[in-house]
Amino acid sequence: EEELQVIQPDKSVSVAAGESAILHCTVTSLIPVGPIQWFRGAGPARELIYNQKEGHFPRVTTVSESTKRENMDFSISISNITPADAGTYYCVKFRKGSPDTEFKSGAGTELSVRAK
């Protein structure tokens, strides 16, 4: 039985350079306990895009519009998009521990950047 779902509803998002990109992610349960983090790319070389607890992410803001009882909104907005930001972004649920361990990832959202 699935303990929770990590839902990234958009397979792809296209944004003009200089604009902001909103990457949507909803999670159906807080349990197992642990944080949500955002990454660009997959595998060991993936880049951390946002971690609520620690780090400095000046271009990233949270944009929760979660009023639904049955899921929670962990969406983010990335400002001032450039071509270097293109790639596939993953919303990842971790299970709290020492260290935290990856529990489940969303399917990913591919960000493409259009010229101004």
Epitope: E1, E3, S29, P32, G34, I36, E70, M72, F74
Partner: antibody, heavy 118, light 112 residues
Framework: EVQLVESGGGLVKPGGSLRLSCAAS????????MSWVRQTPGKGLEWVAT????????YYPDSVKGRFTLSRDNAKNSLYLQMNSLRAEDTAVYYC???????????WGQGTTVTVSS | DIVITQSPASLAVSLGERATISCRAS??????????MHWYQQKPGQPPKLLIY???NLESGVPDRFSGSGSRTDFTLTINPLQAEDVATYYC??????????FGGGTKVEIK
């Protein structure tokens, strides 16, 4: 209609054991995080235990960790709290509660009373 | 542990007037712009009932005279206008990632 019905409470001596049960109906039990919360006149409401929808993950406060064990049987729509090494301070009304998202408690049973006394 | 200080312990309000209850958490209960603070109503001899989830969202079937606000550490439940059937004890509850989950001490609301 959602129903949570607790049973198994009673009077037990310090050091003794009890097993509380919660029978659920009216919702998709296997999709819900389930918890026990207790209430005493002196300490108010206290979270006791939580189990994930599939039963893999359990969480307890330090006050009951190692003494209480939470389990569930999704085929029977039932939740169980095994309470060992009971202490006087465990005396309370124990409520079974459901949560669709693992955060707020949507529905509560009527409670079952546990009294630990010699 | 996150300690929740709820105030006042009791409150007497005239029918039709506004009742305001506060909860302060010892650290932030926010994540990704969501506040994991919830409000419950308990009437004598009954279990608690969820009123407000995640600080400001009205649970289905709850009258809109109940409202919640706040973020991070400071939260408020407002009942306006107060009705006779609102006489009860109200509790806040935080369910942040930092276990254990904890409750406020309760506020007993009575009619003046």
């Amino acid at each position: 209609e959602v129903q949570l019905v607790e049973s198994g409470g009673g009077l037990v001596k310090p050091g003794g054991s009890l097993r509380l049960s919660c029978a659920a109906s009216g919702f998709t039990f296997s999709s819900y995080v389930m918890s026990w919360v207790r209430q005493t006149p002196g300490k108010g409401l206290e979270w006791v235990a939580t189990i994930s929808s599939g039963g893999t993950y359990t969480y307890y406060p330090d006050s009951v960790k190692g003494r209480f064990t939470l389990s569930r049987d999704n085929a029977k729509n039932s939740l169980y709290l095994q309470m060992n090494s009971l202490r006087a301070e465990d005396t309370a009304v124990y409520y079974c509660a459901s949560s669709v998202d693992g955060s707020a408690f949507d529905y509560w049973g009527q409670g079952t009373t546990v009294t630990v006394s010699s | 542990d996150i300690v929740i200080t709820q105030s006042p312990a009791s409150l007497a309000v005239s029918l039709g007037e506004r009742a305001t209850i506060s909860c302060r958490a010892s650290e932030s209960v926010d994540s990704y712009g969501m506040s994991f603070m919830h409000w419950y109503q308990q009437k004598p001899g009954q279990p608690p009932k969820l009123l407000i989830y995640r600080a400001s969202n009205l649970e289905s079937g709850v009258p809109d005279r109940f409202s919640g606000s706040g973020s991070r550490t400071d939260f408020t439940l407002t009942i306006n206008p107060l009705q006779a059937e609102d006489v009860a004890t109200y509790y806040c509850h935080q369910s942040s990632e930092n276990l254990p989950w904890t409750f406020g001490g309760g506020t007993k609301v009575e009619i003046k």
